[in-house]
Interface confidence: medium
Amino acid sequence: SSPTSSASSFSSSAPFLASAVSAQPPLPDQCPALCECSEAARTVKCVNRNLTEVPTDLPAYVRNLFLTGNQLAVLPAGAFARRPPLAELAALNLSGSRLDEVRAGAFEHLPSLRQLDLSHNPLADLSPFAFSGSNASVSAPSPLVELILNHIVPPEDERQNRSFEGMVVAALLAGRALQGLRRLELASNHFLYLPRDVLAQLPSLRHLDLSNNSLVSLTYVSFRNLTHLESLHLEDNALKVLHNGTLAELQGLPHIRVFLDNNPWVCDCHMADMVTWLKETEVVQGKDRLTCAYPEKMRNRVLLELNSADLDCDPILPPSLQTS
């Protein structure tokens, strides 16, 4: 690599010419050990360095901070609090850094933080006040507009004796701090259900990714308040059917695109309304790819090609006639 630093390159050292001419590097802001910095790009990368804590000497200019692939374990309160504050930090990526605990107020004193990625960390303990910073019933609004929490589920033996879904939702709803959140990604978290109140309290959502979970039903989930929702990813879940109430709510969202691929749709009499809706709606992307998984006789049939005669339910036998 060239010894001189250009405006677009990442620098982890003073420009070579400056250090060759004088013994002192230019000072405006230093670059932490084990990081690469570009003042021109306002970016600091401390990537795959096995860091066990957030560097304390981050340059004040940082706008984009990558701390991926480390061994941080715990994010304490005020993990990014500095004097003067990191006033320009807008995008923070902590993915794959072996975090298992994020404490209350971990992201306090970051007034410009708009994007936060905590993906691929086994978060056994996510404080309810991780994003809100305080336990007040109504907190100061968080500046976050994008929150990426894909694959944050810890191994089963490391989970606390509580609902993982509940822990995550508590953090999302605490203090109503995330009212401005526009993108929420919760893919690959083994979610069995979506607590009914979560979406109602995130009214600004444009993009919601719940793909690759274990959602069986959306019966108790309301999308009605999400009038700005543009994309809803529900691929690779365990959905069997969408009922009338859900279908009507989705149809009523003006900008929505829904992704439903790779769900084990049960093509019996309960599927009739969904099939009718699918044939008429424009909101489902790739609807021609949706196929039945059950019952066996219907496996791999395309939902759009079904008619009401195909969708029957076995009669419920009176107990005296049932066999084991």
Epitope: S1, F10, S12, S13, A14, P25, D57
Partner: antibody, heavy 120, light 111 residues
Framework: EVQLVESGGGVVQPGRSLRLSCAAS????????MHWVRQAPGKGLEWVAY????????YYADSVKGRFTISRDNSKNTLYLQMNSLRAEDTAVYFC?????????????WGQGTTVTVSS | DIVMTQTPLSLSVTPGQPASISCRAS??????????MHWYQQKPGQPPQLLIK???NLESGVPDRFSGSGSGTDFTLKISRVEAEDVGVYYC?????????FGGGTKVEIK
């Protein structure tokens, strides 16, 4: 001219303590991260500890963690290494070394070293 | 920890002839932009002196007969024409992560 001068070495019994100093001159000390590196008799180099320019970040080798403490006084242009619970395997020449504000460029100036002998 | 393996252990070179020392890291010490690998020379009774920084950048004041190359895990220090004053032990060192580690050293002697 950049100069780093270590002092404080000597002979000490196992379990005892010693404090090394490194006096810096010829550059703006407070702009630079500083390291301690040691070399056992007839052996290679072993990195020991690092402190950032403003004393906000410290790193230690596993072999000294919990026993050694690196510190600095920017007003005195001096780096320190407090060595407690010394062991025979800590016997070495101890060098202080400077790294620029940015870390891609290695340890660009070294002191002459001070000898620590741990022996009963 | 990243292990730095230097070869050969020692080298006996005729003045004016080239010499080459290899250093292999147990994992990559290069980002997409930079290599965090440095070479030092230690003459008898003296502290180490930085020769090459970031794999290939010659430190100020170092003769240009020294050169460095490599990225990822494999790095090489070359002396194009060895001189008598080049005797000493040469070490590679990474600054990719904590702990920084050094190679075991290569002793260069003059025939």
């Amino acid at each position: 001219e950049v100069q780093l001068v270590e002092s404080g070495g000597g002979v000490v019994q196992p379990g005892r303590s010693l404090r090394l100093s490194c006096a810096a001159s010829g550059f703006t000390f407070s702009n630079f991260g500083m390291h301690w590196v040691r070399q056992a008799p007839g052996k290679g180099l072993e990195w020991v500890a690092y402190i950032s320019s403003g004393s906000s970040t410290f790193y230690y080798a596993d072999s000294v963690k919990g026993r050694f403490t690196i510190s600095r006084d920017n007003s005195k242009n001096t780096l320190y290494l407090q060595m407690n619970s010394l062991r025979a395997e800590d016997t070495a020449v101890y060098f202080c070394a400077r790294s620029p504000a940015y870390y891609r460029y290695g340890l660009d100036y070294w002191g002459q070293g001070t000898t620590v002998t741990v022996s009963s | 920890d990243i292990v730095m393996t230097q070869t050969p252990l020692s080298l006996s070179v005729t003045p004016g002839q080239p010499a080459s020392i290899s250093c292999r890291a147990s994992q990559s010490v290069s980002s997409s932009t930079f290599s965090y690998m440095h070479w030092y020379q230690q003459k008898p009774g003296q502290p180490p002196q930085l020769l090459i920084k970031s794999s290939s950048n010659l430190e100020s004041g170092v003769p240009d007969r020294f050169s460095g190359s490599g990225s990822g895990t494999d790095f090489t220090l070359k002396i194009s024409r060895v001189e008598a004053e080049d005797v000493g032990v040469y070490y590679c060192q990474h600054s990719w992560e904590i702990p920084y580690t050094f190679g075991g050293g290569t002793k260069v002697e003059i025939k």
